[in-house]
């Protein structure tokens, strides 16, 4: 009975996500068969989040809308370890929007999910950000500095990275 009700709950939860994510990849968390964490297929997972590299080129606003439709946001990077995981899936000759912007042009950078902007946990390329007109952040590769962040014009189409919390069933 207990297992039956658990299965019913799982199925109803899966139906919630089916509209945007017809296929989920789930792994057992820890030793308890009861707890599964899932990411949409073919998203990648790291710690408690799922990531999707969008190769379509769109402006920052359209990229964020695109992530939002999938129940995600443009990526918020909280640690060096998280960035190191993300860059494994990026192409060196491309740039990718982050969920970081300065819409007022006053160098008040803000993350899309309202995570406080912490100057101590940023990975700007040297000399960046450097232009008040450039109000959106990308991550890209520079041969001298490897991967880092740069400010660019928000309306210039780029690839992007979406991030969502893992789905627990």
């Amino acid at each position: 009975n207990f297992m039956y009700s658990k299965t019913v709950k799982r199925l109803s939860k899966l139906r919630e996500y089916q509209q945007y994510h017809p296929s989920l990849t789930c792994v057992m968390e820890g030793k308890d068969i009861e707890d599964w964490s899932c990411c949409p297929t073919p998203w990648t997972s790291f710690q408690s989040s799922c990531y999707f590299i969008s190769t379509g080129m769109q402006s920052w606003t359209k990229s964020q809308k695109n992530c939002s439709v999938m129940g995600a946001d443009l990526v918020v990077i909280n640690t060096r370890e998280e960035q190191d995981f993300i860059i494994q899936n990026l192409k060196r000759n491309s740039s990718y929007f982050l969920g970081l912007s300065d819409p007022g042009g006053r160098r008040h950078w803000q993350w899309v999910d309202q995570t406080p902007y912490n100057e101590n946990v940023t990975f700007w390329h040297s000399g960046e950000p450097n232009n008040l007109d450039e109000r959106c952040a990308i991550i890209n590769f520079r041969s001298s500095e490897e991967w880092g962040w740069n400010d660019i014009h928000c309306h210039v189409p780029q690839k992007s990275i979406c991030k969502m919390k893992k789905i627990y069933i």
């Epitope: 769109q58 402006s59 606003t61 359209k62 008040l132 007109d133 109000r135």
Partner: antibody, heavy 121, light 111 residues
């Protein structure tokens, strides 16, 4: 008073090259993102190129990508548009304009009087 | 690319009467409460002049008989009381995503 003065237009044969200039005064030129916009005879407006204030980021529509190059010399308060492999459809009045950000978008707030480019054999 | 479609192509209005120009974007140009549509006026032999930005914000120095409205994909420029000096071609433009694109223009004349 903001002034933008374009020059360098003229008659050129198909396949030829031309370099347009835009001399700016009345603004702190080195802090402005700048754009070129063109207007074919009797037609509407078409964005051609944009360059950021430092000159390290440039953007073009597909119609001119690989043929046109926007650049700037902040010490001379001057914007340039190098146009190569010109075609008849590039015939237009070319305007330079200052770019002003608006949240995630922008506006073109000051415009020059334009310089005419005619591509014809 | 985002296509901006203006209507009508031309408009004849009596002095002192209202003129309304429409602009339709092929996809939404809104984000976070702002619309990325601008309106420009171009008189014969002159460069374009910015009138309205962000769909409804009047540019400094522009008479308040000009107003803009709309959101999403549908936008309107209104001249509440047409003056002789308003004879011009009016263009809408989106700045949400490159390439920036303009409407085909609406010619406003006096009836």
């Amino acid at each position: 008073e903001v002034q933008l003065l374009e020059s360098g237009g003229g008659l050129v044969q198909p396949g030829g090259s031309l370099r347009l200039s835009c001399a700016a005064s009345g603004i702190t030129f080195s802090t402005y993102t700048m754009s070129w916009v063109r207007q074919a005879p009797g037609k509407g407006l078409e964005w051609v190129a944009t360059i950021n204030s430092g000159g390290d980021n440039t953007y073009y529509p597909d119609s001119v990508k690989g043929r046109f190059t926007i650049s700037r010399d902040n010490s001379k308060n001057t914007l340039y548009l190098q146009m190569n492999s010109l075609r008849a459809e590039d015939t237009a009045v070319y305007y330079c304009a200052t770019y002003r950000p608006y949240y995630y978008g922008s506006v073109l707030d000051y415009w020059g009087q334009g310089t005419t480019v005619t591509v014809s054999s | 690319d985002i296509v901006m479609t203006q209507s009508p192509d031309s408009l004849a209005v009596s002095l002192g009467e209202r003129a309304t120009i429409n602009c339709k974007a092929s996809q939404s140009v809104d984000y976070d409460g702002n619309s990325y549509v601008n309106w420009y006026q171009q008189k014969p032999g002159q460069p374009p002049k910015l009138l309205i930005y962000g769909a409804s914000n009047l540019e400094s120095g522009i008479p308040d008989r000009f107003s803009g409205s709309g959101s999403g994909t549908d936008f309107t420029l209104t001249i509440s009381s047409l003056q002789a000096e308003d004879v011009a071609v009016y263009y809408c433009q989106q700045s949400d995503e490159d390439p920036w694109t303009f409407g085909g223009g609406t010619k406003v004349e006096i009836k």
